[in-house]
């Protein structure tokens, strides 16, 4: 009889442990749900607020007309600069006009002073022809002033108010460009 009682007591204790475990699991699950809910709410809020006051350019980007520009705070070679821009959904700066060149050089003067900044311009090794990274040719007034003597790949960069050329493997700051978001209002 005593053995029977102790067996029942052990079974009850085991049941209790299982229920405690289940309760713990449920509490954990509830907490996880609450966290996920919080995350979702925050994400939605974030999306909604950015939709409401959708500024045409991301934070730390500069706007001019239909474009947004990002001036890097790190140095890299031309190829890595291009990669860094692509990760942001942008490309290296492509200067389409003298007005755009003036805006860029004016902005750089205010931000950083006279440094070198890679742009999306490179020279074809065989023909020596300059091309923007989208395959188009620069207008005659926007060709690099000096021809680099490098046997390696040659790329374009902006310094002060000039467009110059250098070995693509040298380290410089860089400028990314993307289209500004159109206001739907």
């Amino acid at each position: 009889k005593l053995l029977q009682v102790s067996t029942i007591a052990m079974q009850q204790q085991e049941k209790l442990i299982q229920q405690e475990r289940a309760l713990l699991n449920f509490t954990e699950w509830k907490r996880s749900c609450a966290l996920q809910m919080k995350y979702c709410q925050a994400f939605m809020q974030n999306s909604l607020s950015s939709a409401h006051n959708s500024s045409p350019c991301p934070n730390n980007w500069i706007q001019n007309r239909e474009s947004c520009y990002y001036v890097s705070e790190i140095w890299s070679i031309w190829h890595t600069s291009q990669e860094n821009c692509l990760k942001e959904g942008s490309t290296l700066l492509q200067i389409e006009s003298k007005e755009e060149m003036d805006f860029i050089t004016g902005s750089l003067r205010k931000i950083k002073g006279s440094y070198d900044y890679w742009v999306g311009l490179s020279q074809d090794g065989h023909s020596g022809r300059w091309l923007w990274q989208d395959g188009s040719s620069p207008s005659p007034g926007l060709l690099p002033a000096e021809r680099s003597q490098s046997a390696n790949q040659v790329c374009g960069y902006v310094k002060s108010n000039s467009l110059l050329s250098s070995n693509c493997s040298t380290w410089k700051y860089f400028i990314c460009e993307k289209y500004a978001l159109r206001s739907s209002v």
């Epitope: 994400f43 974030n46 692509l86 990760k87 959904g89 395959g135 993307k178 289209y179």
Partner: nanobody, 121 residues
Framework: QVQLQESGGGLVQPGGSLRLSCLAS????????MGWYRQAPGKERELVAA???????AYGIAVNGRFTISRDNAKNTVYLQMNSLKPEDTAVYYC???????????????WGQGTQVTVSS
């Protein structure tokens, strides 16, 4: 997880053309950019061409003026038209997608399995 399925590689003579396709398992809107990279034996992987979600295009220096990248949003497919192919274009071509970061998270690039392009007479 995102799947990128390349097709269109093969053997072609110098001066010939090929068109590569990359089908993504997710909508383009979830990527900051999509494009093509290549790796030749003993060389580093290099950018061939990319297109951003805003439609901006970037070509690698070696192919600028010969290759054309395009996309079909409805089909979730990005194409690479390769003209005037040279023996030095021989490589494995990889499709690449750069995800748009979600709420501060950083996710690495997605890569396809690669398709072999051989330019030889």
């Amino acid at each position: 997880q995102v799947q990128l399925q390349e097709s269109g590689g093969g053997l072609v003579q110098p001066g010939g053309s090929l068109r590569l396709s990359c089908l993504a398992s997710r909508s383009f809107s979830s990527f900051n950019a999509m494009g093509w990279y290549r790796q030749a034996p003993g060389k580093e992987r290099e950018l061939v061409a990319a297109i951003t979600n805003g439609g901006r295009i970037a070509y690698g220096i070696a192919v600028n003026g010969r290759f054309t990248i395009s996309r079909d949003n409805a089909k979730n497919t990005v194409y690479l038209q390769m003209n005037s192919l040279k023996p030095e274009d021989t490589a494995v071509y990889y499709c690449n997608a750069k995800p748009t970061p979600v709420y501060g998270s950083t996710v690495g690039d997605y890569w396809g399995q690669g398709t072999q392009v051989t330019v030889s007479s």
